[in-house]
């Protein structure tokens, strides 16, 4: 099995840790973890192209999109590889993350290792909104916290 | 060309940014950057096995050593892949990093992408010391700052 981990940090109170596990190449990736310090509700959750934190979360670039597709939801055929939808925080500001995804991978040409995981200020409308931004970012807003996805033991 | 970047942070004043560039697979990797907040002198500088920052720099594990070799200096045949020797800080606590290395790589089976870059408290004796620790860590001491190596634009 391949394992990865990402420690999310930002300028504000939002922080968290996400663990990734993939039994074998071609198998789904299972994400588990917790993010704290969020406002109640849904927050866009994406893998961004670069593992670059030199300018904070901004330098991570756009959603990881090696196939030049439109933004969508995790269940959509038309989606960025990095489109993992939303995480939902409760009244306590905690989002317990439990995602299984068949598009991201921890190995191969389009591995997410060394890229950036970002949790956003607002909900991701999954490309269904009425403006241009919906087809690019899902209107998820600013980047609250992020971290480079690293190889785990 | 392949590019990577690493933002080094720790619990103390030490911080920095390291840029990596490799023109093609099999070509050397050129490291450039700056680390600040160091004590004057030499500080061990290594790629560690895991890109795991869940317990700070500790969780990065040992030096990246896929060939099960002994610790050495960057010019040695017998070395860990992650053995990049020392960086040298001046009286101002700044180490200007300029390294060219033919053992590390930004691609392939033993890529350093998604692993951790660590700057240490003490000088790395490059495996030439008289104790067991020299053959493992070069007696470089504690981990002052670290960061996961990520893909750059």
């Amino acid at each position: 099995a391949m394992k990865a981990v990402c420690v999310l940090k930002g300028d504000g109170p939002v922080q968290g840790t996400i663990h990734f596990e993939q039994k074998a190449s071609g198998e789904p990736v299972v994400l588990s973890g917790q993010i704290t310090g969020l406002t109640e509700g849904q927050h866009g959750f994406h893998v961004h192209q670069y593992g670059d934190n030199t300018q904070g979360c901004t330098s991570a670039g756009p959603h990881f999109n090696p196939h030049s597709k439109k933004h969508g939801g995790p269940a959509d055929e038309e989606r960025h590889v990095g489109d993992l939808g939303n995480v939902t925080a409760g009244k306590d500001g905690v989002a317990n993350v439990s995602i299984e995804d068949r598009v991201i991978s921890l190995s191969g040409e389009h591995s997410i290792i060394g890229r950036t995981m970002v949790v956003h200020e607002k909900q991701d409308d999954l490309g269904k909104g009425g403006n241009e931004e919906s087809t690019k970012t899902g209107n998820a807003g600013s980047r609250l916290a992020c971290g480079v996805i690293g190889i785990a033991q | 060309a392949m590019k990577a970047v690493c933002v080094l942070k720790g619990d103390g004043p030490v911080q920095g940014t390291i840029h990596f560039e490799q023109k093609a697979s099999g070509e050397p990797v050129v490291l450039s950057g700056q680390i600040t907040g160091l004590t004057e002198g030499q500080h061990g500088f290594h790629v560690h096995q895991y890109g795991d920052n869940t317990q700070g720099c500790t969780s990065a594990g040992p030096h990246f050593n896929p060939h099960s070799k002994k610790h050495g200096g960057p010019a040695d045949e017998e070395r860990h892949v992650g053995d990049l020797g020392n960086v040298t800080a001046g009286k101002d606590g700044v180490a200007n990093v300029s390294i060219e290395d033919r053992v590390i790589s930004l691609s392939g089976e033993h890529s350093i992408i998604g692993r951790t870059m660590v700057v240490h408290e003490k000088q790395d004796d490059l495996g030439k010391g008289g104790n067991e620790e020299s053959t493992k860590t070069g007696n470089a001491g504690s981990r002052l700052a670290c960061g996961v190596i990520g893909i750059a634009q």
């Epitope: 509700g41 439109k70 038309e78 909104g129 009425g130 241009e132 919906s134 087809t135 | -």
Partner: antibody
Framework: EVQLVESGGGLVQPGGSLRLSCAAS????????MSWVRQAPGKGLEWVAN????????DYVDSVKGRFTISRDNAKNSLYLQMNSLRAEDTAVYYC?????????WGQGTLVTVSS | VIWMTQSPSLLSASTGDRVTISCRMS??????LAWYQQKPGKAPEVLIY???TLQSGVPSRFSGSGSGTDFTLTISCLQSEDFATYYC?????????FGQGTKLEIK
């Protein structure tokens, strides 16, 4: 400039059919979910149907399911609403709008009157 | 079906006033709420989506707030062109529904 222009409305008898069209310009039509929203005379707004950018998914309000069909032709930058078995309560101005869940630009609307 | 109660149905105000319009849901909708403005004989225009995000080109005197089941549209300083009918809309679950509207008229 984004433009949505509806056509095809008119007077039709109960049980009859109409096909509404919406011509889109000024944006990449094939990138967007699209919707139809209607407004009965002097009343509020009612979402009717939406369709995914590639036409692979559609959803409808219960009151029109099985009678109305939303479709699109991305090559022609056009959205359609085929309305069958029309009822008096379908009388409304029908708007096409960009977006599948909330609606950005809207067309000017086309009036459908179902009456004998 | 999520039921929406918009209040008031009719609101009389003067230019320069600060006005608020309320929208209450029958169940929580997270932040899946939009606000629209409609002038007589015209199509609606989106003002705000995701509770508080101002649509491009909409004046900053419009703002949205709220969470869960209770949401508010605020116009901080009424201008003459703001007299219109306002609708809230939830897009949390099918069918997507609108409030019954608030007509904002000149006092």
């Amino acid at each position: 400039e984004v433009q949505l222009v509806e056509s095809g409305g008119g007077l039709v008898q109960p049980g009859g059919s109409l096909r509404l069209s919406c011509a889109a310009s000024g944006f990449t039509f094939s990138s967007f979910w699209m919707s139809w929203v209607r407004q009965a005379p002097g009343k509020g707004l009612e979402w009717v149907a939406n369709i995914k950018h590639d036409g692979s998914e559609q959803d409808y309000v219960d009151s029109v399911k099985g009678r109305f069909t939303i479709s699109r032709d991305n090559a022609k930058n056009s959205l359609y609403l085929q309305m069958n078995s029309l009822r008096a309560e379908d009388t409304a101005v029908y708007y096409c709008a960009r977006g599948g869940i909330w609606f950005g630009p809207w067309g000017q609307g086309t009036l459908v009157t179902v009456s004998s | 079906v999520i039921w929406m109660t918009q209040s008031p149905s009719l609101l009389s105000a003067s230019t320069g006033d600060r006005v608020t319009i309320s929208c209450r849901m029958s169940q929580g909708i997270s932040s899946y709420l939009a606000w629209y403005q409609q002038k007589p004989g015209k199509a609606p225009e989106v003002l705000i989506y995701a509770v508080s995000t101002l649509q491009s080109g909409v004046p900053s005197r419009f703002s949205g707030s709220g969470s869960g089941t209770d949401f508010t549209l605020t116009i901080s300083c009424l201008q003459s062109e703001d007299f219109a009918t306002y609708y809230c809309q939830q897009y949390y679950s099918f069918p997507y529904t609108f409030g019954q509207g608030t007509k904002l008229e000149i006092k």
